[in-house]
Amino acid sequence: MDGSGEQPRGGGPTSSEQIMKTGALLLQGFIQDRAGRMGGEAPELALDPVPQDASTKKLSECLKRIGDELDSNMELQRMIAAVDTDSPREVFFRVAADMFSDGNFNWGRVVALFYFASKLVLKALCTKVPELIRTIMGWTLDFLRERLLGWIQDQGGWDGLLSYFGTPTWQTVTIFVAGVLTASLTIWKKMG
């Protein structure tokens, strides 16, 4: 489900613009957090800080928690480490497209997309290609806008993420997220 009919233009949580703004805030915060945990100075990630409201802060915490869990999945880390970043755009869009290729959308896959973007950003930092950072963030938001926006609107905006991961079994969902990303990377490697 991409964009269904005309997108609402108001300022509510399901307006196109609000979803994109919140998505950009969450992505930026998530990537900055992942980079900070590596311990390295990353002035390239010192993007304009935007004040977060209480709802966005909760969402950011939720994403951090899932990110930490995914970091401890060794199979996933091995797969990501093996990604050839000579053509990062092709890798990103192939993996992203594959994650949603069956037409089934859920918050787990949205988080997997953010996580994969963060790993590509960290690779860019390690390989001293800082100009790629904003580019990768841009690709992620482009993909979100063109493929996921309508679905996020149908979930009532980003707050749907909290209810999805707010269950006692959120670790189980995180295992599913890792599986989605691992499967997509496997397919990409076979195609490559």
Partner: antibody, heavy 119, light 109 residues
């Protein structure tokens, strides 16, 4: 109401330059992607260039790479196409279009501006 | 780059006919395929996005489908206002390397 209005077309000699503008209204271009598509007289549509103003990420068709530059000024809500080293084969109607939420389909288009490259 | 081969390049049909236009991708693509209608001297208009989703305000006689690398636009019952040129467009080869099909002119028989 969403609107895209192109301007800047005209007659230019081979090797010359021209700058096209696309003024957007009814939406904010910041989180959109903006595109230029051209159509030579009696021919089909050809994608020229795209920009995502949020990240300033740009992409170009091979036929214009190194000669054309797409840019955006979010404060003016306007996208631009700077065309240098123009050739006769660049003669076309140039359309500005946006994509926003429809799988990279272009949901709104401008009326087009004619660029004629001739001596 | 991915090429989109559109067929036929032109066709003649009568009002009420069922019309089918096909675009074949040169390699496997995702469903990021759109269809447009263009009339002389006018900008194209979006009909179908994501291979099979009908854009807002487009009559339901237009539909899109996908089978592997083949994408099809179908007009179930051709109306007088449907005589125009139709284009497919893909952006699946690593956005935004976008390509259009060559176009199909639908003329009155």
């Amino acid at each position: 109401e969403v609107q895209l209005v192109e301007s800047g077309g005209g007659l230019v000699q081979p090797g010359g330059s021209l700058r096209l503008s696309c003024a957007a209204s009814g939406f904010n271009i910041y989180y959109s992607s903006m595109h230029w598509v051209r159509q030579a007289p009696g021919k089909g549509l050809e994608w020229v260039a795209s920009i995502s103003p949020y990240s300033s990420y740009t992409s170009y068709a091979d036929s214009v790479k190194g000669r054309f530059t797409i840019s955006a000024d979010t404060s003016k809500n306007t996208a631009y196409l700077q065309m240098n080293s123009l050739r006769a084969e660049d003669t076309a109607v140039y359309y500005c279009a946006r994509s926003f939420g429809y799988g990279w389909a272009f949901d709104y288009w401008g009326q087009g501006t004619l660029v004629t490259v001739s001596s | 780059d991915i090429q989109m081969t559109q067929s036929p390049s032109s066709l003649s049909a009568s009002v009420g006919d069922r019309v089918t236009i096909t675009c074949r991708a040169s390699q496997s693509v995702s469903s990021a395929v759109a269809w447009y209608q263009q009339k002389p001297g006018k900008a194209p208009k979006l009909l179908i996005y994501s291979a099979s989703s009908l854009y807002s305000g487009v009559p339901s006689r237009f539909s899109g489908s996908r089978s592997g690398t083949d994408f099809t636009l179908t007009i179930s019952s051709l109306q007088p206002e449907d005589f125009a040129t139709y284009y497919c467009q893909q952006s699946a080869g690593g956005y935004p390397l976008i390509t259009f099909g060559q176009g199909t002119k639908v003329e009155i028989k």
